[in-house]
């Protein structure tokens, strides 16, 4: 079989900024890692920034995570909570282009969803979203 | 339809699962009008960190 990457990049989307977190193979040490749905491919999810008033633009820094070269799991050095969210969009049709971040359909839908979440979770604690995956309903 | 799966990140202690879900559900009507996205079947769960990609995914099929 042909090879794709063993690591991938996800984008944390937030107001006016994108904090990029790279997933790497377990043997590597990385200061900040978010597991990706695309863990065997080099795909980077396109980041999206919403336009906000300068006064309300919130530049977030993501607390570092530490990991070791051992098989043990990395530990949080400062606190970030992650939530897995799943939902159906009943008025859209899945097609194969939603498996590829370089397609227009994927990018448009990702952009709308990113904007939507920035609207929903305006409070200061929101760091962003990552690992968007689309599948047929 | 399209199923969307994603991970949300918050500073620890600023929100819980229930509030994540509640706020999202409250926004569904506006999502339909603003983005033309008709949202249903919302499911939210904690992702224990660190987590494996596999366990992260298989919880939700």
């Amino acid at each position: 079989a042909s090879g794709s990457a063993s690591g991938s990049a996800s984008t944390l989307v937030h107001n006016g900024t994108s904090a990029r977190a790279t997933t790497t193979p377990a043997s590597k040490s990385t200061p900040f890692s978010i597991p990706s749905h695309h863990s065997d491919t080099p795909t980077t999810l396109a980041s999206h920034s919403t336009k906000t008033d300068a006064s309300s633009t919130h530049h977030s820094s993501v607390p570092p995570l530490t990991s070791s070269n051992h098989s043990t799991s990395p530990q949080l050095s400062t606190g970030v909570s992650f939530f897995f969210l799943s939902f159906h969009i009943s008025n859209l049709q899945f097609n194969s282009s939603l498996e590829d971040p370089s397609t227009d359909y994927y990018q448009e839908l990702q952009r709308d969803i990113s904007e939507m979440f920035l609207q929903i979770y305006k409070q200061g604690g929101f760091l962003g979203l990552s690992n968007i995956k689309f599948r047929p309903g | 339809s399209v199923v969307v799966q994603l991970t949300l990140a918050f500073r620890e202690g600023t929100i819980n699962v229930h509030d994540v879900e509640t706020q999202f559900n409250q926004y569904k009507t506006e999502a339909a009008s603003r983005y033309n996205l008709t949202i249903s079947d919302v499911s939210v769960s904690d992702v224990p960190f660190p987590f494996s990609a596999q366990s992260h995914h298989h919880h939700h099929h």
């Epitope: 695309h38 863990s39 080099p42 194969s96 282009s97 498996e99 397609t103 047929p136 | 596999q54």
Partner: antibody, heavy 117, light 107 residues
Framework: EVQLVQSGAEVVKPGASVKMSCKTS????????INWVRQRPGQGLEWIGY????????EYNEKFKGRVTLTSDTSASTAYMELSSLRSEDTAVYYC??????????WGQGTLVTVSS | DIQLTQSPSSLSASVGDRVTITCRAS??????LNWLQQKPGKAIKRLIY???SLDSGVPSRFSGSRSGSDYTLTISSLQPEDFATYYC?????????FGGGTKVEIK
Amino acid sequence: EVQLVQSGAEVVKPGASVKMSCKTSGYTFTSYGINWVRQRPGQGLEWIGYIYLGSDYTEYNEKFKGRVTLTSDTSASTAYMELSSLRSEDTAVYYCARSAGSLFGYWGQGTLVTVSS
Amino acid sequence: DIQLTQSPSSLSASVGDRVTITCRASQDIGITLNWLQQKPGKAIKRLIYATSSLDSGVPSRFSGSRSGSDYTLTISSLQPEDFATYYCLQYASSPYTFGGGTKVEIK
């Protein structure tokens, strides 16, 4: 390492059907798409269709609609392609290619189908 | 259907040469183009995805670029293992289509 292992070569008679498999391994997720592509002897590549593993979602090239059926078995991480009403021009190597965060990321080794009376 | 016109259909080159293969798309496909490598008896391998992104494990001598509707695969310094057939593939719209292929042979 991600691998796509396809079933062995087939020799079939004109008018018959053939069903081939594409088993994926080395990947943690059960949700992804499989594209099917064929290559006739000495020719280029031709897209047949797509199935999202574990669902009944399919897309077909109009040229093959009605003769091709794509199915999958999530528990076996396997996709299947059945081609019916075979004719000599269907003699080809049939490839599966799976998505891995983007389309056509990994390819199987191919299944040679020979249509001969 | 979107047509991909790939040129040349074959070329002879020597180790160390710079090789350029072009695909022209009949309609706008954005960046939704892959480059594939096929060697006899081996699985097809994707080299480039999304026009210019290099797959992991693919040597950096391979690169992809775009100018309007023309998409180019460049091998900066041809190596013995690069003698193969190369295909472009568009996935902007179904049915997905391939270029006719370019066979790179030893001069």
